[in-house]
């Protein structure tokens, strides 16, 4: 994991200050209000998945 100010997070992930690590943009459909999702705006939005039965 990268710290802020060093190498950027790998492709498809974004830095989370809340969690202090790079996080996967793929988790943003389920957790859209996560701080790191702002850094995932360039990725095409995935439709919301059926997490609630």
């Amino acid at each position: 994991e990268q710290a802020p100010g060093t190498a950027p997070c790998s492709r498809g992930s974004s830095w989370s200050a809340d969690l202090d690590k790079c996080m996967d943009c793929a988790s943003c459909p389920a957790r859209p209000h996560s701080d790191f999702c702002l850094g995932c705006a360039a990725a095409p939005p995935a439709p919301f998945r059926l997490l609630w039965p």
Partner: antibody
Framework: EVKLGESGGGLVQPGGSMKLSCVAS????????MNWVRQSPEKGLEWVAE??????????HYAESAKGRFTISRDDSRSSVYLQMNNLRAEDTAIYYC??????????WGQGTSVTVSS | DIVLTQSPASLAVSLGQRATISCKAS??????????MQWYQQRPGQSPKLLIK???KLDSGVPARFSGSGSGTDFTLNIHPVEEEDTATYYC?????????FGGGTRLEIK
């Protein structure tokens, strides 16, 4: 270092109750959904229950086999998650693991606690 | 519920060779952007450990000899070259919807 410690397992008779506990450390507990997953030779790995965050009003979800019998809860002040199991059946015999997930991946697993339901 | 079918149930691979494990889902677990499929390793007597997330992304600290691929309903875990420490059972798991389900596991033995 992430640590997850399950406890509370043991031998219980059919129809009985048991409460499992899991104490977590090494990650921001309040930001992670928490799961219970069980493993038996007969059914393999089987997701049991999930509890989300305070901001989600601690929403809970259950596998069909757990609905109406099991209750998942969490205490953020103690970084702990619990599984209250009632009306236990022989098919509930398994090793029970707690595991945090941010959204999709069960990032860490404890050592598990063994539950045996038998007369 | 989404059913995950793994094959083979077990395999024996010579040290240094390639191990290939398949996981087929009963419905698609992918969008145009992401695949919601994970792989876990469980060594004998141990708890499961996350290896690969979102079909192809290695978890932190996982050696590069592990790789995942696939989308839709067909996914593959490859290990090359296999090492002694890879003796374990491997499970796929989807996070497309609730309930989360796991494959039945593939036991890998190193010859």
């Amino acid at each position: 270092e992430v640590k997850l410690g399950e406890s509370g397992g043991g031998l219980v008779q059919p129809g009985g109750s048991m409460k499992l506990s899991c104490v977590a450390s090494g990650f921001p507990f309040t930001k992670y959904w928490m799961n219970w997953v069980r493993q038996s030779p007969e059914k393999g790995l089987e997701w049991v229950a999930e509890i989300r965050l305070k901001s989600d009003n601690y929403a809970t979800h259950y596998a069909e086999s757990a609905k109406g019998r099991f209750t998942i809860s969490r205490d953020d002040s103690r970084s702990s998650v619990y599984l209250q199991m009632n009306n236990l059946r022989a098919e509930d015999t398994a090793i029970y693991y707690c595991s945090p997930t941010y959204a999709d991946t069960m990032d860490y697993w404890g050592q598990g606690t063994s539950v045996t339901v038998s007369s | 519920d989404i059913v995950l079918t793994q094959s083979p149930a077990s395999l024996a691979v010579s040290l240094g060779q390639r191990a290939t494990i398949s996981c087929k889902a009963s419905q698609s677990v992918s969008t145009s952007t992401y695949s919601y499929m994970q792989w876990y390793q469980q060594r004998p007597g141990q708890s499961p450990k996350l290896l690969i997330k979102y079909a192809s992304k290695l978890d932190s600290g996982v050696p590069a000899r592990f790789s995942g691929s696939g989308s839709g309903t067909d996914f593959t875990l490859n290990i090359h070259p296999v090492e002694e420490e890879d003796t374990a059972t491997y499970y796929c798991q989807h996070s497309w919807e609730l309930p989360y389900t796991f494959g039945g596991g593939t036991r890998l033995e190193i010859k």
